[in-house]
Amino acid sequence: EPLPWAPESLKVSINSTHQCLHLQWSVHNLAYHQELKMVFQIEISRIKTSNVIWVENYSTTVKGNQLLHWSWESQLPLECAKHFIRMRSAVDDATTPEQRFWSNWSSWEEVDVQNSLGHEPLFVFPKDKLVEEGSNVTICYVSRSQQNNISCYLEGVRMQGQQLDPNVSMFNLHNVAFIRETGTNIYCKVDRGDDIKGIVLFVSKILEEPKDFSCETRDFQTLSCTWDPGRDTGLLKQLPQSYTLFESFSGKKTLCKHKGWCNWQVAPESQEMYNFTLTAENYLRKRSVHILFNLTHRVHPMAPFNVLFKDVSVTNATMTWKVHSTGNYYTLLCQVELYGEGKVIQKHNVSVKVNGELVLSGLEPDTEYSAQVRCANANHFWKWSEWTRQNFTTVEAAPSEAPDVWRNVKSVQGYCVVTLFWKPLSRLQANGEILFYNIVVEDLDRPSGLQLLSVPAPANRTELTLDQRAYQIHVTANNSVGTSPASVLVVSGDPGDEEVEEERVKGTEDGFSLSWKPQPGNITGYIVEWCDRPRDPLCDLQWKHLGPNTTSTVISSDAFRPGVRYNFRIYGISTEMVPYLLEKKTGYSQELAPSDNPRVVMSNLTSHSFTLSWKDYSTESQPSFIRGYHVYLKSKAGQCHPGSEKAVLSDDSVCCKYKIDDPKQKMFVVGNLQPESFYEFLVTPYSAVGEGPHGAFTKVTTPDEYSPM
């Protein structure tokens, strides 16, 4: 006999957008207060009742007069085919499910959405469906006419489908990919017909779990939570992901306005523990992450402020700063970095409650420093605050070093003209701005005879005219605080410089390597002197101080040029501060071939000889050491006499070449000539790196034998 609690009043509604069938029914004959565990078997057929595509047993507890609901999502859009639904019921006896007594089936309920489609010749479903990347999707077309051949395309590529009935074909898309934010285009068209019908399949990239979720407070009033939302789902702003923060201890929840951060008001009742759940959610899915923390362990202090320097002296300064009050009087650890010339020169750690103080010592006078401070929770380190930076300058001190002084002495009309040179003190030596230099000239024969001269900075030279006696010169640098130690130098009328022999040195890319013999007796040091621009009238005098135990040095300068001769003088400085010349060196950083030939004067022309001379040719001003000269002689006969050799010039002309090996020999007699003959000559200097240019030859014709001299 049929079960008394059969399903009745079965109603089926549809939700096309979600491709869902909603079933609603009731069970009669149940007393109002009665509860019964029941199972309902639901069958769904497609196209015809015999084509069952879904069977499901739905178990629930039924109360009297209760409306029951069940939903089913169809893979195939509901518009694509008729669906039929029926159900039956049984009492749910879990102990013997195989012995269930089923009620009769309800009558089939038919759902046919196609009836409401309208009168167009072609439809494509589903419309504007939103799916996740990687999903499988079924689409279909419904045609109002059976005659036409219909083709469907996915992004322009024809799809293979399967016919459900003469008017309907369906297409299964597997593992759909994200193509563009405006969706994937699918369209169908009648092959020889009218129009195209398209749908858009909106494909979302899979919503990612938020990464690096973290919260912190800067002021104990607001918790700032941040996270990395991961890759964008690729959907335009109509259906983006939303983010929600839920805190379980307080039970509060907030919808975040931004994709990657959210603020949470700290409870005034001093809640210490927080248990947050961050939920990312879009139309298709939810993703959650959790963090549990103690508020005092997540303090990211605000940057210190009011950074000041007091009691700034020559070598010390007291740095003070304030930190923002947090209400909870816990200790901050502050880190101080002191910068000098852009580099960290000191690091300090200081514990601070409200005000910080630190004495910076070991500083240089008149130096600009920069100090920066940042703070973090001392008990539970979380994050450093931002740095706060402030500059200060130490106080000036008297210059600490004597200026580096040298001189140039010339005798002019019985007087001694002394040009004094000094190098500016370095910043570390000057200890402040140098305002002037004091020069004291002391006559060593008359110690009471003092001359004082003041030269304003930034001058680096002065000229003194003295008589031929010995003088001691003191030079000091002065700033607003005081005077430097003095540089002392003795000058006398006769420097005795000229008796020293000059020695040649070979320069390299690195400069000139100079060495000298050590001097016996008391010597305080050596000075090497040279000119950076020897061809200029002012010559740019340079000097280098060396210790008493040094007998070699390398002199290098950016001013050194190839083809320029540099002259070096090495002086010893006696204990009485008297400089005396020890050695002279001369050389080239790089020798170049001679650039011009001597201006030659011809004389004593006879029928058999003539004399060539080039007395005013200066070998010192040449771009290399001149080793000698070549005299070239061209003649019609082309014969070369002893003492000369045949030479072929660059223009293939042949001549005779005479070689002079002494650079001081600036005269040459060309002999063995024929009377009334035509000759051409050229004189070129030569050096280790080449000879002068083969320019124009000078023409000469010898007279007959009887012509007067």
Partner: antibody
């Protein structure tokens, strides 16, 4: 036959507002996405806005975002374009289009002229 | 924005001629290229969509081809009624953009 008829043309001052309508007939309006496309006095065509068949998806050109609103009434078979904060560069002939494929304007109305001038 | 360029702004041809109008995209548009015809009275019609598919009611003398960034519209046998301005348009990437148009005239 597909028929799209725009209306609402007018002369507006800069900063003013105007609402355009497009009456659709000859097809099931609710089945199709629709767009507005305009043609400037220099005869350049510019896509303005798009709305999906159900109205869930709406896109705008950057030049009109925040000033123009596209909407549809499927019961009335009508497409709308609410234009506000109008600028002189919005002066154009506005066409309503039916889009069977996203970004393809298969059928066009005859156009309605909007002039923005002081 | 993706730029569409029609290098020829006007073109003269004789009736019966084979005419080709070209269009270049500033980046790959995956064949989402449409061609429109605008008659002198302002009427606009879709001729070809998805590079080469003829829209319903469009004569078969019209054809389209291309890929990547270079596309063209060909009229194989020019007729009087084809006198119009032709626009290309990409539908691959927002914002959807049009070429500047090519005006076709009779010699």
């Amino acid at each position: 036959d597909v028929k799209l008829v725009e209306s609402g043309e007018g002369l507006v001052k800069p900063g003013g507002s105007l609402k355009l309508s497009c009456a659709a007939s000859g097809f099931t309006f609710s089945s199709y996405a629709m767009s507005w496309v305009r043609q400037t006095p220099e005869k350049r065509l510019e896509w303005v806005a798009y709305i999906s068949s159900g109205g869930d998806y709406i896109y705008y050109a950057d030049t009109v975002k925040g000033r123009f609103t596209i909407s549809r009434d499927n019961a009335r078979n009508t497409l709308y374009l609410q234009m506000s904060s109008l600028k002189s560069e919005d002066t154009a002939m506005y066409y309503c289009t039916r889009d069977p494929i996203t970004g393809t304007f298969a059928y066009w109305g005859q156009g309605t002229l909007v002039t923005v001038s002081a | 924005d993706l730029q569409m360029t029609q290098t020829t702004s006007s073109l003269s041809a004789s009736l019966g001629d084979r005419v080709t109008i070209s269009c270049r995209a500033s980046q790959d548009i995956n064949n989402y290229l449409n061609w429109y015809q605008q008659k002198p009275d302002g009427t606009v019609k879709l001729l070809i969509y998805y590079t080469s598919t003829l829209h319903s009611g469009v004569p078969s003398r019209f054809s389209g081809s291309g890929s990547g960034t270079d596309y063209s519209l060909t009229i194989s046998n020019l007729e009087q009624e084809d006198i119009a301005t032709y626009f290309c348009q990409q539908g691959n990437t927002l914002p959807w953009t049009f070429g500047g148009g090519t005006k076709l005239e009779i010699k």
